[in-house]
């Protein structure tokens, strides 16, 4: 299933992650998928 609004898939962690966390960790792999 696709990630819910405000989250993006992390290949590194194999789960959906909150885009909000990209403020603290902008280089996370999933941040590229965050608007």
């Amino acid at each position: 299933a696709p990630c819910s609004r405000g989250s993006s898939w992390s290949a590194d962690l194999a789960k959906c992650m909150d885009c909000a966390s990209c403020r603290a960790r902008p280089h996370s792999d999933f941040c590229l998928g965050c608007a």
């Epitope: 590194d12 909000a20 966390s21 403020r23 603290a24």
Partner: antibody, heavy 119, light 111 residues
């Protein structure tokens, strides 16, 4: 399932030292920031210290109340977190919780270990 | 440091009641997109448990009767219909900057 297990608590005299440990399992430990949070008897929660990742050069941050006395560290090869506590004071008496989080909200918590500082 | 003021410090309620807990930060903890405010539940003798992150995102496995709202400095945790297992102490926490700080807690007791 995720598990964080603290150990090392106990009774120590004022001015003494103690080293807490936290063994982690069930998540990618090396990718998660880790903190210690404490709770004095009958009181609220207080953040104590944080350690970030190898890619952050294991950056550490401390509450003013423990700066210069406590040292947080981690060993990713052992999935373990530590808190070295020196120059302990009566006001450091608390249950100490190990917490894990990717960023921001503390997703994972241990059961806590009690530290009592008393003569 | 950002101060977190929770209210009330305690409340008595009955099963089925709607319960609202508020948390006020001494400065904004929000961007235009996200709020860096989180809510935890703690039962006696147990570790805290994350309920809601980023002001309104329900953690996996948390019942839908819990909800969070707010932005800027003012935030609310609501329990739409209080259940026996909800009697506990609730804490807010910001992650806007270091040091992270928690509210003083709200103890929800049985009326």
């Amino acid at each position: 399932q995720v598990e964080l297990v603290e150990s090392g608590g106990g009774l120590v005299q004022p001015g003494g030292s103690l080293r807490l440990s936290c063994a982690a399992s069930g998540f990618t430990f090396s990718s998660y920031w880790m903190s210690w949070v404490r709770q004095a008897p009958g009181k609220g929660l207080e953040w104590v210290a944080e350690i970030r990742l190898k890619s952050d050069n294991y950056a550490t941050h401390y509450a003013e109340s423990v700066k210069g006395r406590f040292t947080i560290s981690r060993d990713d090869s052992k999935n373990s977190l530590y808190l070295q506590m020196n120059s302990l004071r009566a006001e450091d008496t608390a249950v100490y919780y190990c917490t894990g989080y990717y960023a921001d909200a503390m997703d994972y918590w241990g059961q806590g270990t009690l530290v009592t500082v008393s003569s | 440091d950002i101060q977190m003021t929770q209210s009330p410090s305690s409340l008595s309620a009955s099963v089925g009641d709607r319960v609202t807990i508020t948390c006020r930060a001494s400065q904004s903890v929000s961007t235009s997109s996200y709020s860096y405010m989180h809510w935890y539940q703690q039962k006696p003798g147990k570790a805290p448990k994350l309920l809601i992150k980023y002001a309104s995102n329900l953690e996996s496995g948390v019942p839908s009767r819990f909800s969070g709202s707010g932005s800027g400095t003012d935030f609310t945790l609501t329990i739409s219909s209080l259940q026996p297992e909800d009697f506990a102490t609730y804490y807010c926490q910001h992650s806007w900057e270091i040091p992270y700080t928690f509210g003083g807690g709200t103890k929800v007791e049985i009326k």
